[in-house]
Interface confidence: medium
């Protein structure tokens, strides 16, 4: 599923991401935009043999199990395919674990490069939340 901007903002708010670990909703929507272009079925392969999955491009070396990533830790204890569902519950739950890990949203390269220090509230402006 490819979410609309405000549709995703509403879904993320419903799942408790607004101000989760101090990160406003705009940060999460911005991250999703530049990680997956709001596409729940996005997959991207990395040079280390791992793959990033879903709307928040969660990595198979650390967070989920795709059955084929060397040394996978599967810290979210889920199959990576669950992160590709049109229901973002699994992605959100895993993202909560990632953002609590110590580096906050710096774990997402796209957030670090495209969202951090910008007017992230623009990503939810005009949305009826």
């Amino acid at each position: 599923k490819v979410f609309g901007r405000c549709e995703l903002a509403a879904a993320m708010k419903r799942h408790g991401l607004d101000n989760y670990r101090g990160y406003s909703l705009g940060n999460w929507v911005c991250a999703a935009k530049f990680e997956s272009n709001f596409n729940t079925q996005a997959t991207n392969r990395n040079t280390d043999g791992s793959t990033d999955y879903g709307i928040l491009q969660i990595n198979s070396r650390w967070w989920c199990n795709d059955g084929r990533t060397p040394g996978s830790r599967n810290l979210c204890n889920i199959p990576c395919s669950a992160l590709l569902s049109s229901d973002i519950t699994a992605s959100v739950n895993c993202a909560k674990k990632i953002v609590s890990d110590g580096n906050g949203m710096n774990a997402w390269v796209a957030w670090r490069n495209r969202c951090k220090g910008t007017d992230v509230q623009a990503w939810i402006r005009g949305c009826r939340l």
């Epitope: 079925q41 997959t43 392969r45 040079t47 043999g49 795709d66 059955g67 084929r68 990533t69 060397p70 199959p79 990576c80 395919s81 590709l84």
Partner: antibody, heavy 116, light 107 residues
């Protein structure tokens, strides 16, 4: 136990298309990538590409883009590979395998012969 | 693409001999290298994963070693059932690639 059952041998005319199937049993089909591999005598094994049945995500070896198309039917736990515009170069044995990085589980292979 | 070069192309041995098959990668692939045996008209069979991890059910006479670019499959005291083709395969990056194979034949 994990099994991959491929469709039977095919004899096709040049220019035609063919669809090969791979039925998976014994594991959660949507969770693992299905890979496709080509084998021609004297050409070894070639990786064609892969599909993640749960999402339909696909990746193709550049060499096979436009030649192969992958689909999957999660209701029947079956992956498919369609090969188009067949030529004699496409005559080969085609395998599906479960993508664990390594390939512990293989189909028995489908022999495709392209001949006028 | 990562190229895998296997040598020798053919190895003629007598049952009871010990042999080593080589697989060389065009760039470093860490330990992401796997070995297969294939007999005529059969699907490949996984022997060794991640360079040195013998798969369940594979006899202990098969062993793998190496890291980076140079890898070896060793068969200690070859048995008649071991004759056939041997392929290496890398999973370090895409596209996945295979070596050209080594044919192990009876002398």
């Amino acid at each position: 136990q994990v099994q991959l059952q491929e469709s039977g041998a095919e004899v096709m005319k040049p220019g035609a298309s063919v669809k090969i199937s791979c039925k998976a049993t014994g594991y959660t089909f949507t969770t693992y990538w299905i890979e496709w591999v080509k084998q021609r005598p004297g050409h070894g094994l070639e990786w064609i590409g892969e599909i993640l049945p749960g999402s339909g995500s696909t990746y193709y070896n550049e060499k096979f883009k436009g030649k192969a198309t992958f689909t999957a039917d999660t209701s029947s736990n079956t992956a498919y590979m369609q090969l188009s515009s067949l030529t004699s170069e496409d005559s080969a044995v085609y395998y599906c395998a479960r993508g664990d990085g390594w390939y512990c589980y293989w189909g028995q292979g489908t022999t495709l012969t392209v001949s006028s | 693409d990562i190229e895998l070069t296997q040598s020798p192309a053919t190895l003629s041995v007598t049952p009871g001999d010990s042999v080593s098959l080589s697989c060389r990668a065009s760039q470093s692939i860490s330990n992401n290298l796997h070995w297969y045996q294939q007999k005529s008209h059969e699907s490949p069979r996984l022997l060794i994963k991640y360079a040195s991890q013998r798969v369940s059910g594979i006899p202990s006479r098969f062993s793998g070693s190496g890291s980076g670019t140079d890898f070896t499959l060793s068969i200690n005291s070859v048995e008649t059932e071991d004759f056939g083709m041997y392929f290496c395969q890398q999973s370090n990056s895409w596209p996945r690639t295979f070596g050209g194979g080594t044919k192990l034949e009876i002398k």
